[in-house]
Interface confidence: low
């Protein structure tokens, strides 16, 4: 008997969702002090078997009805007739003005119906069940809290569109508000919730609540049958009403394919064709870029970029324009490039600044520190595999084997090709000719160029920096010129036509001091390269007049801001006048110049480079660290 009662109770409780606490948010319910509480009679830990309210509902905010269980009367104990009394809380006091239910019939068994005459939307109600004069249950609520609209009616659907693949379709579902809901006058504002699922599925998919009576449902599978249902609730209060009758949606077959799993075959076909197409494109790319790939595998000699020259000119091989820029003077022969068939352009990558935490490869090659034993240079070598510009010269020298290692790195690392790092190297193709002899044309006439004195010179900001900031080297051995940077970088071309070179190393942290006693250093090179290739050390030996046993020390001026990109010759003079931050070295010690300008192009011998920022001890010199005049040049020429 008790089990039967429990089942009945659960059935009644399950049929009602009007008072399900989970469905009504606290914010909504807190609008009125006379809140209703979700009561599941069979689930309550209540020892009494008295009648309980199960549901109070208003379908349209104009009438309402309340229902209760009648457990006791199905048992052995008879407590007498069940009566419902109600009171409207429209007074300030706790009044006891109870009236009996106006209609026990209209809403069915164990119910009380309140028509519009007995319904007031704004006034809270309290209701109680009595038996033999004793209260067995009581609830309070406002009508707004118990609004549960009737189900939406007249559901239908229309096809919106079908996907290109014919796999999915979109539909528009429409319905009408319940007949008794006064939507037009705004007495009720309903929000709707649509749910749908495949016929064979158990879980409904819910869509977000909407205020309109139609909604699109997207991406339904073609050839599947769907169930759609809609329910509504009074906006901002109450609970969802019952669901509408289920609408069945069957989407017709619209594709020539008939596959279960989202038409697997066409997708596979697309993938196959895609892979094939990509492979073809890859082959085309590989064949068209054969030279690039060859250079990636066999990297070329690293050459710094030429500042002031559009890298695109170099990349596209437009030598005429490069020559025009470089050869502003009559003395320069443009035929130099255009006539020689062996001139080749090689794209190089300039190492990233963060990769330059070690010595420059020049320093390694020329270092007299034999204790440093490197297995290889450890830097990206740009040797293309053919004879490098200066390789024989370097190998000719009396370098210690520990210092040289290999001219080219065995490790071919992939090159990061920067847009502005496409550099020019003039390599020798003809292996039969001497690769290092008489490569420079003998047609060039000596030409003295006077630079503008006050022309600002840009500091090379992208040049890599060496970690060692001061290197002490004995110049007694002419090959020990590790502090002289052989990356002479063209940093500017003055309006007067001088090509201003700057070293690619040791210039980021600041300028070398100008206040030491300098020695004029001229570098000669047989294989005259218009770009910043290696100055061959063997040729340098022929041309550099060096005072014996003069110790060279490179000083970094830390007071110069790294962000000061342009430094004028005046600023160099100022720097020269400043006391050095390093210890003061004797007159016999000299800093290596950071800025060098081309003053004479000596036929075939090469260039005479002059230190711009260094005053000359015994000769007449400019007060500012500018360019050396012709007269001064004649004086200082050996």
């Amino acid at each position: 008997m008790d089990l039967w009662q429990l089942l009945l109770t659960l059935a009644l409780a399950g049929s009602s969702d009007a008072f399900s606490g989970s469905e009504a948010t606290a914010a909504i319910l807190s609008r009125a002090p006379w809140s209703l509480q979700s009561v599941n009679p069979g689930l309550k830990t209540n020892s009494s078997k008295e009648p309980k309210f199960t549901k109070c509902r208003s379908p349209e905010r104009e009438t309402f009805s309340c229902h209760w269980t009648d457990e006791v009367h199905h048992g052995t104990k008879n407590l007498g007739p069940i009566q419902l009394f109600y009171t409207r809380r429209n007074t300030q006091e706790w009044t006891q003005e109870w009236k009996e239910c106006p209609d026990y019939v209209s809403a069915g068994e164990n119910s009380c119906y309140f028509n519009s005459s007995f319904t007031s939307i704004w006034i809270p109600y309290c209701i109680k069940l009595t038996s033999n004069g004793g209260t067995v249950d009581e609830k309070c609520f406002s009508v707004d809290e118990i609004v549960q609209p009737d189900p939406p009616i007249a559901l239908n659907w229309t096809l919106l569109n079908v996907s290109l693949t014919g796999i999915h379709a979109d539909i528009q579902v429409r319905w009408e508000a319940p007949r008794n809901a006064d939507i037009q006058k705004g007495w009720m504002v309903l929000e709707y919730e649509l749910q749908y699922k495949e016929v064979n599925e158990t879980k409904w998919k819910m869509m977000d609540p909407i205020l309109t009576t139609s909604v699109p449902v997207y991406s339904l599978k073609v050839d599947k049958e769907y169930e759609v249902r809609v329910r509504s609730k009074q906006r901002n209060s109450g609970n969802y009403g019952e669901f509408s009758e289920v609408l069945y949606v069957t989407l017709p077959q619209m594709s020539q394919f008939t596959c279960e799993e989202d038409f697997y075959f066409p997708w596979l076909l697309i993938i196959i064709f895609g892979i094939f197409g990509l492979t073809v494109m890859l082959f085309v790319f590989l064949f068209s870029k054969q030279q690039r790939i060859k250079m990636l595998i066999l990297p070329p000699v690293p050459v710094p970029k030429i500042k002031g020259i559009d890298p695109d000119l170099l990349k596209e091989g437009k030598l005429e324009e490069v020559n025009t820029i470089l050869a502003i003077h009559d003395s320069y022969k443009p035929e130099f490039h255009s006539d020689d068939s062996w001139v080749e352009f090689i794209e190089l990558d300039i190492d990233e600044p963060d990769e330059k935490t070690e010595e420059s490869d020049t320093d390694r090659l020329l270092s007299s520190d034999h204790e440093k034993s490197h297995s290889n240079l450890g830097v990206k070598d740009g040797d293309s595999g053919r004879t490098s510009c200066c390789e024989p010269d370097i190998l000719e020298t009396d370098f210690n084997a520990n210092d040289i290692h290999e001219g080219t790195s065995e490790v071919a690392q992939p090159q990061r090709l920067k847009g502005e790092a496409d550099l020019l190297c003039l390599d020798q193709k003809n292996q039969n000719n001497s690769p290092y002899h008489d490569a420079c044309p003998a047609t060039q006439q000596p030409s003295v160029i006077q630079a503008e004195k006050n022309k600002p010179q840009p500091l090379p900001t992208e040049g890599a920096e060496s970690t060692h900031q001061a290197a002490h080297i004995q110049l007694s051995n002419p090959s020990s010129l590790s502090n002289i940077d052989f990356y002479a970088q063209v940093s500017d071309i003055t309006p007067a036509g001088s090509v201003v070179l700057s070293p690619g190393q040791k210039n980021k942290a600041g300028m070398s001091q100008c206040d030491m006693h300098p020695e004029m250093v001229s570098l000669c090179q047989e294989n005259f390269l218009m770009d910043n290739a290696y100055f061959c050390e063997a040729d340098a030996k022929k041309c550099i007049p060096v005072a014996p046993h003069i110790k060279v020390e490179s000083h970094i001026q830390p007071s110069l801001n790294q962000e000061d990109i342009y430094i004028t010759t005046e600023s160099l003079t100022t720097a020269a006048g400043r006391p050095g931050t390093g210890e003061h070295v004797p007159g016999s010690e000299m800093p290596v110049p950071d800025y060098t300008s081309i003053h004479i192009v000596q036929s075939p011998q090469g260039l005479i480079l002059n230190a711009t920022a260094l005053p000359l001890p015994d000769k007449e010199f400019l007060s500012s660290c500018g360019y050396v005049s012709t007269d001064q040049l004649n004086k200082i020429m050996p």
Partner: antibody
């Protein structure tokens, strides 16, 4: 986070007046029922008054009817208890509390959040 | 007004004991009864509402039940933090609120 903070308590002579404030945060006083409950030293809890701002209903215990007035300023989210004609027996810690809305159907005016209380001492 | 008679007024118990506190309403209040715990100098805390519903965050060792006009609060296994004073409250919508006089649970 729901919080209630009472203020305005103090020492007052018999026959005097005092206004207690209950500042609410974390919920809207407009849609809630605010109650005042007091506790005399060493005694039990005694319900004093309540207000349901949404409907404008106010309720009082018989012991304070006519002397105490409960009100609310919804713009300040604060409830007040104006106490006039105070007596010695009104000496107590006054708590404001919020009625717990269980939602749905089984109505019960339980008080879920309480303030820390403010002491009112009526003495000559 | 409905009177709530709470018993016992005090009791001594040990940790782990099962404790039962009873409240009797002077007339039918349906299930509109709540139980509170109060510690000295603190505000009351809601434990049970609607006679038998456990308030959120309250340990499950607390439970409430109703038999007619008798309402019971049970602590299944008393814990050290449970030593406090417990109040019942009738919250019938048709009557002014009334509290029981309280039951003080002390350590034996």
């Amino acid at each position: 986070e729901v919080q209630l903070v009472e203020s305005g308590g103090g020492l007052v002579q018999p026959g005097g007046s005092l206004r207690l404030s209950c500042a609410a945060s974390g919920f809207n006083v407009s849609y809630s029922s605010i109650h005042w409950v007091r506790q005399a030293p060493g005694k039990g809890l005694e319900w004093v008054a309540s207000i349901s701002s949404y409907y404008g209903y106010t309720y009082y215990a018989d012991s304070v009817k006519g002397r105490f007035t409960i009100s609310a300023d919804t713009s300040k989210n604060t409830a007040y208890l104006q106490m006039n004609s105070l007596r010695a027996e009104d000496t107590a810690v006054y708590y404001c509390a919020r009625r717990y809305w269980m939602g749905g159907y089984a109505y019960s005016m339980a008080l879920d959040y309480w303030g820390q209380g403010t002491l009112v001492t009526v003495s000559s | 007004d409905i009177q709530m008679t709470q018993s016992p007024s005090s009791l001594s118990a040990s940790v782990g004991d099962r404790v039962t506190i009873t409240c009797r309403a002077s007339q039918s209040v349906s299930s509109a009864v709540a139980w509170y715990q109060q510690k000295p100098g603190k505000a009351p805390k809601l434990l049970i509402y609607s006679a038998s519903s456990l308030y959120s965050g309250v340990p499950s060792r607390f439970s409430g039940s109703r038999s007619g006009t008798d309402f019971t609060l049970t602590i299944s296994s008393l814990q050290p933090e449970d030593f406090a004073t417990y109040y019942c409250q009738q919250s019938s919508s048709t009557q002014p609120f009334t509290f029981g006089q309280g039951t003080k649970v002390e350590i034996k």
